[in-house]
Interface confidence: low
């Protein structure tokens, strides 16, 4: 084969958002017949030559960016996309509210507001079932997530987290869930 080996995938199971003291497994997946895997934590000297890292109890020190690669013969693959492993529950949960309210007519507007009592400048909003968050660096203790022209697809359960840009992988506990109901669809 000419050129670099294709990059592997790196995933965290069951999730890359891991409550403190809960287990998580990091799994590097390359093509069949790989000779050697290397899984490393960036900005540290921590690495292992195995495809799977099982963390029985999440700690603050394990939060951060990870990547992996593999070796076939003398060739190393391109590195995987970075995985951000986040420790949650480090700080008290924020509150999540909907303005003007959690019931909104289809086509209307609603703003989800994540608010914390402490000095955080970063917020992440998750919709249950969606793996990717809406991230919003706004005011240091409150972020607003406007949803313009609401549709039925916006219905669902939302949670938010707060954290500091100083320690971007140490997050609060999740807010209590907020159920957004879209009416008139």
């Amino acid at each position: 084969q000419s050129g670099p080996l294709p990059k592997p995938s790196l995933q965290a199971l069951p999730s890359s958002l891991v409550p403190l003291e809960k287990p998580v497994t990091l799994r590097c997946q390359g093509p069949p017949g790989v000779d050697l895997y290397r899984l490393e934590k960036l900005s540290s000297s921590r690495y292992q030559d195995q495809a799977v890292l099982f963390i029985p109890a999440m700690k603050r020190s394990l939060a951060g960016r990870y990547r992996c690669s593999y070796q076939n013969g003398s060739l190393w693959s391109l590195p995987s996309d970075q995985l951000e492993l986040v420790a949650t529950g480090v700080f008290a949960k924020p509150s999540l509210s909907a303005q003007p309210g959690p019931a909104v007519s289809s086509g209307g507007d609603v703003t989800l507001q994540c608010q914390t009592r402490y000095g955080f400048d970063q917020f992440a909003l998750y919709k249950e079932g969606d793996p990717a968050p809406y991230k919003n660096p706004e005011r240091w203790y409150r972020a607003s997530f406007p949803i313009i022209t609401v549709t039925a697809a916006h219905s669902g359960t939302y949670r938010c987290y707060s954290f500091s840009s100083r320690d971007p992988y140490l997050w609060s506990a999740p807010s209590d869930p907020l159920e957004l109901v879209v009416t008139g669809t």
């Epitope: 509150s95 509210s97 303005q99 402490y118 240091w140 203790y141 100083r166």
Partner: antibody, heavy 114, light 106 residues
Amino acid sequence: EVQLLESGPGLVAPSGSLSITCTVSGFSLTGYGVNWVRQPPGKGLEWLGMIWGDGSTDYQSTLKSRLSISKDNSKSQVFLKMNSLRTDDTARYYCARDLPMDYWGLGTSVTVSS
Amino acid sequence: DIQMTQSPSSLSASVGGRVTITCKASQDINKYIAWYQHKPGKGPSLLIHYTSTLQPGVPSRFSGSGSGRDYSFSISNLQPEDIATYYCLQYANLLTFGGGTKLEIK
């Protein structure tokens, strides 16, 4: 224009209770928090507590047992209640918007004396 | 609760000069510090938040810096209208004011 206006009783008897109202305009109490701060004569500023947009409250730990903050969003009013007053509660009481308190009222003077 | 130790408690400087006030927190406050100017008969005015961010309309003569537990606030090219008491405020965990610094002009 954002404005906050405090109104209070002026004079309160020792061991009595204090009620102060902060009436705001130019912003909604559902979207912003309001703090209470006081300044005793010749002394510095002291944060008392805060009510958030969602109605939750935080209090300075040493005053928590004597302090209550509430609000009426529809009237754009925030209320400070303090009981078991002592002479050292004599101060100018201010309300201020949000974190880190970008708008303030002019304050209302409270004297605790018999 | 986080304690804020502000110094000096008073200072005197000449017009056109420069003054610096410091605040030390009892624990790391992650840059969540604000600075206020307070003149008699008025409510305090927010000058700086998040260590160094100037409020709109505040002259660039005012500045702030710091990290961790140690923070400072400076006024350069001092003007007569800067006579006031200045306070730091931490808002990393609840809120705590420093004791204040009374600024006088020589």
